[in-house]
């Protein structure tokens, strides 16, 4: 997001209250070009050996308020026969993203930046087998 100073004179970046003097332009720009998203496959969630489902995570006090999150369908992985393989585990791949959270009871609205862990897909890993001593 682009940070735009509130006044025509840019605030002093060394001032302690610098972050109180900026406003954020929430317009989302696709710098990679429009064709990028159309190449993003959406069927991996079903074709994967560790398939996942997507859930619409809504938080009206967050920007963005809608985030689609992955959840692994099974604890185990699916083998070539379509059966669950008990030697392989399905694990969630998570990505840390930055979101803006609305401060409660603030008027006009003020937001704070927060980190959020989002599930983006699942992958298959070998189960840890502990040998008996």
């Amino acid at each position: 997001a682009a940070i735009i100073p509130q006044s025509s004179a840019c605030p002093n970046t060394e001032a302690k209250d610098f972050l109180q003097n900026v406003k954020v332009n929430l317009k989302v720009f696709n710098s990679l070009g429009a064709k990028v998203s159309s190449r993003r496959p959406s069927d991996y969630l079903n074709r994967s050996t560790s398939p996942w489902t997507l859930h619409r995570n809504e938080d009206p006090d967050r920007y963005p308020s809608v985030i689609w999150e992955a959840q692994c369908r099974h604890q185990r992985c699916v083998n070539a026969e379509g059966k669950l393989d008990h030697h392989m585990n399905s694990v969630l791949i998570q990505q840390e993203i930055l979101v803006l959270k609305r401060e409660p009871e603030s008027c006009p609205f003020t937001f704070r930046v927060e980190k959020m862990l989002v599930g983006v897909g699942c992958t298959c890993v070998a189960s840890i087998v502990r040998q008996a001593a």
Epitope: A34, R40, S42, D43, T53, R56, W68
Partner: antibody, heavy 119, light 107 residues
Framework: EVQLVQSGAEVKKPGASVKVSCKAS????????FHWVRQAPGQGLEWIGV????????AYNQNFRDRATLTADKSTSTAYMELSSLRSEDTAVYYC????????????WGQGTLVTVSS | DIQMTQSPSSLSASVGDRVTITCKAS??????VGWFQQKPGKSPKLLIY???NRYTGVPSRFSGSGSGTDFTFTISSLQPEDFATYFC?????????FGQGTKLEIK
Amino acid sequence: EVQLVQSGAEVKKPGASVKVSCKASGYTFTDYEFHWVRQAPGQGLEWIGVIHPGNGGTAYNQNFRDRATLTADKSTSTAYMELSSLRSEDTAVYYCTRFLTYEGYFDYWGQGTLVTVSS
Amino acid sequence: DIQMTQSPSSLSASVGDRVTITCKASQSVSIDVGWFQQKPGKSPKLLIYHASNRYTGVPSRFSGSGSGTDFTFTISSLQPEDFATYFCQQDYSSPYTFGQGTKLEIK
């Protein structure tokens, strides 16, 4: 120019299923959510559910969870809404609408598809 | 589910009149409210989003205000093409819900 063009009117018998299509043009199909809303004759609007064509994710109104299925075909930039076990109360105009996920509002709507359920 | 109670359900007015429609949410929806115009046999058309922002190309006679649970939609000077049904909608949380609509008729 953004356009959402829906399939034509349908007449169905109770217990049957209907599949309504919504073809998008004028923007990148996978960038925005598609929501489905219906309007019974002389009634208000009722939200059915949402699909994100970019990731295949869906979410439904509890009232429709067991009967509605939302899908999207990226190759033809078309979203679909299938409603099963139809009853007379499902007679309505069904709309698809584009939702700007980041901005948070519905901007473009399809022209609507009238589904009549009658024996 | 969040209920959106819209009033009045119908309204008679003349060209040039100032018209106000209200919408009350059953719980706070912040500013996540839109206002739509619908003419017979047509799909809804977005006029106002985020309670008070006019959508692209919408004439300045249309305005909206409010936050929390109480919202107002105003047409400052009615034009002949404004006679239609208007409804509010919340997209604060799903299931997204709509007001029952206000039918604006010529007096």
